[in-house]
Interface confidence: low
Amino acid sequence: RPSFSLVEDTTLEPEEPPTKYQISQPEVYVAAPGESLEVRCLLKDAAVISWTKDGVHLGPNNRTVLIGEYLQIKGATPRDSGLYACTASRTVDSETWYFMVNVTDAISSGDDEDDTDGAEDFVSENSNNKRAPYWTNTEKMEKRLHAVPAANTVKFRCPAGGNPMPTMRWLKNGKEFKQEHRIGGYKVRNQHWSLIMESVVPSDKGNYTCVVENEYGSINHTYHLDVVERSPHRPILQAGLPANASTVVGGDVEFVCKVYSDAQPHIQWIKHVEKNGSKYGPDGLPYLKVLKHSGINSSNAEVLALFNVTEADAGEYICKVSNYIGQANQSAWLTVLPKQQAPGREKEITASPDYLE
């Protein structure tokens, strides 16, 4: 891939990280353990397709079948969860499409998130029959080990009965679990005997114990939570963005670049320019100018807004995004029409972008 002559020095990273950036999530495919999952690689004109999972090259095995543009996973398990990618290799370029697979029933420790059946777990006792706590629905407690992708919601349940009605408290790693122990706290739904943690992070890993007690006794049950963080990867740019645009002289236009990156991304908007009347340097490489980059003085770096455009603004605009692992870039073309010619449908220009890697 080519390197470029730059009008401005693009090698300097900002002193401080970008103050604001959006994260665009790839498509998520959800399957329950034991189910089969089929995903089609959404890339066109693929001569050769290769697959990865969390950065590891994925080959066929007794549960994974790769047929043409399809990936099939038979009898999915939580270990199949992760960030997948298919790369289409063509004669002139390659393109990658990313998607998430989430194989887990951990979100509800045995039921759906809405607790539609939760009232059944709240067992009222005849006031004459004094009884120590007991589990009312052990099926919902059988799965003790929960491996959950970061950012998911986790719910642990301990449906119980007793008379008088027992109280429930939660321990983390054997110690009282307090709201201040995690960012965002947690929810306890006593009538559903549940603990809910939203947007889990690696520090949430550990053993969670429900203690259910009344004056006649105490019972407890422990769940183990493992928060699986995705392996890092180079930035991913949403396909089709930035999109080609057209406007009249004096008009305004906006280019948008949607970025997905686990690591902090650095966004640059770059344009081909002329220097001393030439578009190319003595080495034959094009001159490029950095129009905008993420940094403390930059508003939303994913959007490049051009106001009162002139014919000189026409051309190719490149959104280049890098993190410490690698970089990605996509480009779009701006067509500037004379004022008397009102813009119609966006002008379709197909061109292979100059990759900056």
Partner: antibody, heavy 120, light 107 residues
């Protein structure tokens, strides 16, 4: 230049634990993974697992999953491998290796190895 | 796990010889194969990654080839410093696995 310097040889009794260190220098510690590989006397190489120092993401060989713990101290660019419930067949030279990612899982620099002897 | 089988397990050759070591995988590993060199008292050295890419600083007499399940490391003209043990390693699937090694000795 890139260097991985490991801690010295250890002699342990069966059932005990051992913790081997691997100090990295000559590169940015958080930009590469650290893998651990062992080699029993007269035997081949066996991959144990890796840790990503940036986010402490680990991945273990199932064979060792319940006994090995990989950690890092990024402030001193050091990775650690702790193996518990040692058995005599854990006698081996333990290597740390720098893993390049995501271009491919190859180990481009290795430590000198730490001999762990498990004997009663 | 993917099994990697190297052959031969040991090999005697002379300086100047052309030597070939093969590595066979129990399933297709899509060229995701590396080669390493181990000498007594020295750190293990990466020679070739992704089947045929020569690691920086490795002499051009080393080359790699193969596809599917069968891969080869070739040393075109043996030098005295090449006598060592060589290992292949697959990175097609976890856990990463190595061949049992090929010991190259002086004839």
């Amino acid at each position: 230049q890139v260097q991985l310097v490991q801690s010295g040889a250890e002699v342990k009794k069966p059932g005990a634990s051992v913790k081997v260190s691997c100090k990295a220098s000559g590169y940015t510690f958080t930009r590469y993974w650290i893998h651990w590989v062992r080699q029993a006397p007269g035997q081949g190489l066996e991959w144990m697992g890796y840790i990503n120092p940036r986010n402490v993401y680990t991945n273990y060989n199932e064979k060792f999953k319940n006994r090995v713990t990989l950690t890092v101290d990024t402030s001193i660019s050091t990775a650690y491998m702790e193996l518990s419930r040692l058995r005599s067949d854990d006698t081996a030279v333990y290597y740390c290796a720098r893993g390049d990612w995501p271009e491919g899982y190859y180990f481009d620099f290795w430590g000198q190895g730490t001999l762990v002897t498990v004997s009663s | 796990d993917i099994q990697m089988t190297q052959s031969p397990s040991s090999l005697s050759a002379s300086v100047g010889d052309r030597v070939t070591i093969t590595c066979s995988a129990s399933q297709d590993i899509n060229n995701y194969l590396n080669w390493y060199q181990q000498k007594p008292g020295k750190t293990i050295k990466l020679l070739i990654y992704y089947t045929s890419t020569l690691q920086s600083g490795v002499p051009s007499r080393f080359s790699g080839s193969g596809s599917g399940t069968d891969y080869t490391l070739t040393i075109s003209s043996l030098q005295p410093e090449d006598f060592a043990t060589y290992y292949c390693q697959q990175f097609s699937d976890l856990p990463f696995t190595f061949g049992q090694g090929t010991k190259l000795e002086i004839k």
